[in-house]
């Protein structure tokens, strides 16, 4: 029901997990620290959807336009496989974002512009994805300077082979970077080049 | 051939109002970001406006500078980009851009890779 | 806002030099930075993004590099027809903002 949250003004952990949501509920609570919407319905995420969450911390989408291939679960993905779409200013509020989770979005981009004001985001996920290709660029890891744990796993593309793992020079700017993580990144062999970019 | 041709600018008073045409071609005009820039005589460059993509609903962003007064929108029937300014000042005059986002996969880059030749407008008494 | 500083309005070269265009910004822009040219009585044109990608068409003797608030742009052997405006702006945050120029003349 519309404003259902609103009333709950102490409220600081909302989970709505595993239901039939189909969009971010309006008007919640402003004190929020942690929102998770991750395995609903949700299509598309609207400019405004987070406009008031100035405190929110972590934030969890994951599941929403599932990428289905090969998952050993029942899993059903939006219409053609396409992602969950998200406007370019959904996150601008977030300005104390520690923790974003992308997982199974079946995202194929990650644009810059949605990182512009999240510069506290320590933590990533865009693990089960179909970024293969972006991971090779992934220009937006410039704007997360203070990024320390970053989940590309499963992002491989379909019937590809790749002959070595290519990281993004990008990574090099992530100077408190201690995790990451690239499994199910499918390729022959690893080059002496592959982790030039995790030297420091 | 991608083009932006603007038109609409002339002399005005402070206070009056004008509006600014920019006419779009070679490409799928509601698939971009659209922006206004512009240069007052012997300044930098300044960007005024902005009018997203379909993907983001045609949702306006604006500088301080002018936001309150200049209004920005599109016919995506026709491909024309326009900017309504109102309650003009001395300020206001320069030549006034139509920019193209250069776009990534739908989303904005902020940075210019097709601009129009500029219509000139002149606030004064 | 973030502001542009390029410190030279004018640099004199002559054909075939070497020259560096530089431009500082007032924060931290993690590569973001664009360059433009715009010769005399025409717009703008895009030749550099995120401080180092050359735009479609762009010749090769134009490169950029810079990390953090400094940034170059370097024409490796000018030629006349570089006689120009050049201008930096950064896209890591809106408004995007532009430096206030560069001319470069031809001895």
């Known amino acids: 029901e519309k404003d259902a949250f609103l009333v709950m003004r102490n409220l600081k952990v909302l989970s709505l997990k595993d239901n039939n949501v189909t969009a971010v509920p309006t008007t919640l609570p402003p004190n929020l620290l942690e929102l998770y919407l991750y395995n609903n319905i949700i299509k598309k995420i609207q400019e405004n959807d987070f406009n008031n969450l100035n405190e929110l911390q972590v934030l969890d989408l994951s599941g929403n336009c599932p990428r289905c291939y090969n998952v050993p679960y029942p899993c059903t993905p939006c219409e053609n496989n396409s992602p969950l779409q998200i406007h370019d200013n959904a996150f601008n509020s977030l300005t104390e974002l520690k923790v974003l989770r992308l997982h199974s979005n079946s995202l194929q981009h990650v644009p810059p512009t949605w990182f512009k004001n999240m510069r506290n985001l320590q933590e990533l996920d865009l693990s089960q994805n179909y970024l293969a290709r972006e991971i090779e660029e992934a220009k937006f890891l410039h704007f997360l300077p203070n990024l320390v744990e970053l989940d590309f796993s499963f992002n491989y593309e379909l019937q590809v082979y790749h002959a070595s793992i290519t990281l993004p020079h990008s990574l090099s700017s992530l100077e408190n970077l201690k995790i990451l993580r690239v499994k199910g990144y499918v390729f022959k062999e690893l080059k002496n080049s592959s982790l030039s970019v995790l030297h420091k | 051939e991608v083009k932006l041709v603007e038109s609409g600018g002339g002399l005005v008073q402070p206070g009056g109002s004008l509006r600014l045409s920019c006419t779009t071609s070679?490409?799928?005009?509601?698939?971009?970001?659209m922006e206004w820039v512009r240069q007052p005589p012997g300044k930098r460059l300044e960007w005024i406006a902005a009018?997203?993509?379909?993907?983001?609903?045609?949702?306006?962003e604006y500088s301080a500078s002018v936001k309150g007064r200049f209004i920005v929108s599109r016919d995506t029937s026709q491909n024309i980009l326009y900017l309504q300014m109102n309650a003009l000042r001395a300020e206001d005059t320069a030549i006034y851009y139509c920019?193209?986002?250069?776009?990534?996969?739908?989303?904005?880059?902020?940075?210019?890779?097709?601009w129009g030749a500029g219509t000139t407008v002149t606030v004064s008494s | 806002d973030i502001v542009m500083t390029q410190s030279h309005k004018f640099m004199s070269t002559s054909v075939g030099d070497r020259v560096s265009i530089t431009c500082k910004a007032s924060?931290?822009?993690?590569?973001?930075v664009a360059w433009y040219q715009q010769k005399p009585g025409q717009s703008p044109k895009l030749l550099i993004y995120w401080a180092s990608t050359r735009h479609t068409g762009v010749p090769d003797r134009f490169t950029g590099s810079g990390s953090g608030t400094d940034y170059t742009l370097t024409i490796s052997s000018v030629q006349a027809e570089d006689l120009a405006l050049y201008y930096c702006q950064q896209h890591y945050n809106t408004p995007p903002t532009f430096g206030g120029g560069t001319k470069l003349e031809i001895k």
């Open positions: 920019a193209r986002d250069a776009d990534y996969y739908g989303s904005s880059t902020w940075y210019f890779d097709v």
């Open positions: 924060q931290d822009v993690r590569t973001a």
């Open positions: 009018s997203r993509n379909k993907r983001n609903d045609h949702t306006t």
């Open positions: 070679g490409f799928t005009f509601s698939d971009f970001y």
